[in-house]
Amino acid sequence: YPNASPLLGSSWGGLIHLYTATARNSYHLQIHKNGHVDGAPHQTIYSALMIRSEDAGFVVITGVMSRRYLCMDFRGNIFGSHYFDPENCRFQHQTLENGYDVYHSPQYHFLVSLGRAKRAFLPGMNPPPYSQFLSRRNEIPLIHFNTPIPRRHTQSAEDDSERDPLNVLKPRARMTPAPASCSQELPSAEDNSPMASDPLGVVRGGRVNTHAGGTGPEGCRPFAKFI
């Protein structure tokens, strides 16, 4: 069904999921339609993210289904917003020595975390595991992201950009194949193997101490063994 979803052939092929991982479990950061941010034990349509890299290690993170930017208030609370505020909705990305990624607000200094406590990022610190993230390519069939493409002839450019803030629905060239270091993909979600139904089930290994290929937040990150 090549044309089953209007999203096929668009940049939705570049969706990723950010997840925390301990030795036994993992939680995926998801941005709900109402702006609430929490973690899920598995990939969901609300944990599918677009991450745009900017200069000096800054990133902008958007939930593609909620159409909301990930933002942070002055107390360190994270939430999803339809409106992009450069002070609240840009995060500094840093890769720790263990290969895990942390994101913190340059404005308020708090770490993005799936834990409830708010902690400021300090260089050299060892954040708790629920503030350290790995990224994983989307394993959810694109048909599940079946939202209509904006009808541009009935909308102003302003309306259009609000519905599609990062232009994720505008067709573009397909992603190039992953480098060899990233080729250990999990089975596709159409596969009937146990891993396909649980691409990020319960993590076995502890913290990974090697850097893997990929330099930006969309590159391959080291990850523990999944069951």
Epitope: R24, G115, P128, Y130, S197, V202
Partner: antibody
Framework: QVQLVQSGAEVKKPGASVKVSCKAS????????MHWVRQAPGQGLEWMGI????????SNAQKFQGRVTMTRDTSTSTVYMELSSLRSEDTAVYYC??????????WGQGTMVTVSS | AIQLTQSPSSLSASVGDRVTITCRAS??????LVWYQQKPGKAPKLLIY???SLESGVPSRFSGSGSGTDFTLTISSLQPEDFATYYC????????FGPGTKVDIK
């Protein structure tokens, strides 16, 4: 409100198996991992294992590998823990507990399992 | 696997006393430490998460501190309902519990 309701007390003979249930309500069952923790009489808490509620994937403490089986039924929002080859030292209260990323916030009331010949 | 040790294993105190319980991890666990209170015949109750954050509904006389390997639970003024056993638990790479500290009446 969140509730975890466990099955009733059990008395088993050595070598037998026991299956304890934990029915969750008041929240979206598939959004939280569930753990099993046990406590022998007069002793401390001992973590047994974890189950992913959506996939059924499990990970157990090394001590229980091969003896404990955790399953779930998403249609009834229930998790199960089966312990086989019971011995007297398995006499304990068994708890299920909900994971909220940084803590176990809700616990079942506990199920007393007595292993005696 | 990371091991947790608690001290003291038991202590006797009076109402109004300041009580301090320590929990030590065999290796660094950042702030991924939780404290629970358990009374006889009851399930554990969450008191502190992320080493120092007070769980909603828990009295402010309870506080937690520490990071890395050394952690402390403090009860600033012991109340009659606080006589119980207290457990620490780490969330860094597993879910290990400490052996517990029993607080009883002097």
């Amino acid at each position: 409100q969140v509730q975890l309701v466990q099955s009733g007390a059990e008395v088993k003979k050595p070598g037998a198996s026991v299956k304890v249930s934990c029915k969750a309500s008041g929240y979206t069952f598939t959004n939280h991992y569930m753990h099993w923790v046990r406590q022998a009489p007069g002793q401390g808490l001992e973590w047994m294992g974890i189950i992913n509620p959506i996939s059924g994937s499990t990970s157990n403490a090394q001590k229980f590998q091969g003896r404990v089986t955790m399953t779930r039924d998403t249609s009834t929002s229930t998790v199960y823990m089966e312990l086989s080859s019971l011995r007297s030292e398995d006499t304990a209260v068994y708890y299920c507990a909900r994971d909220i990323v940084d803590a176990f916030d809700f616990w079942g009331q506990g199920t007393m399992v007595t292993v005696s010949s | 696997a990371i091991q947790l040790t608690q001290s003291p294993s038991s202590l006797s105190a009076s109402v109004g006393d300041r009580v301090t319980i320590t929990c030590r991890a065999s290796q660094g666990i950042s702030s991924a430490l939780v404290w629970y209170q358990q009374k006889p015949g009851k399930a554990p109750k969450l008191l502190i998460y992320d080493a120092s954050s007070l769980e909603s509904g828990v009295p402010s006389r309870f506080s937690g501190s520490g990071s890395g390997t050394d952690f402390t639970l403090t009860i600033s003024s012991l109340q009659p309902e606080d006589f119980a056993t207290y457990y620490c638990q780490q969330f860094n790479d597993d879910f290990t519990f400490g052996p517990g500290t029993k607080v009883d009446i002097k």
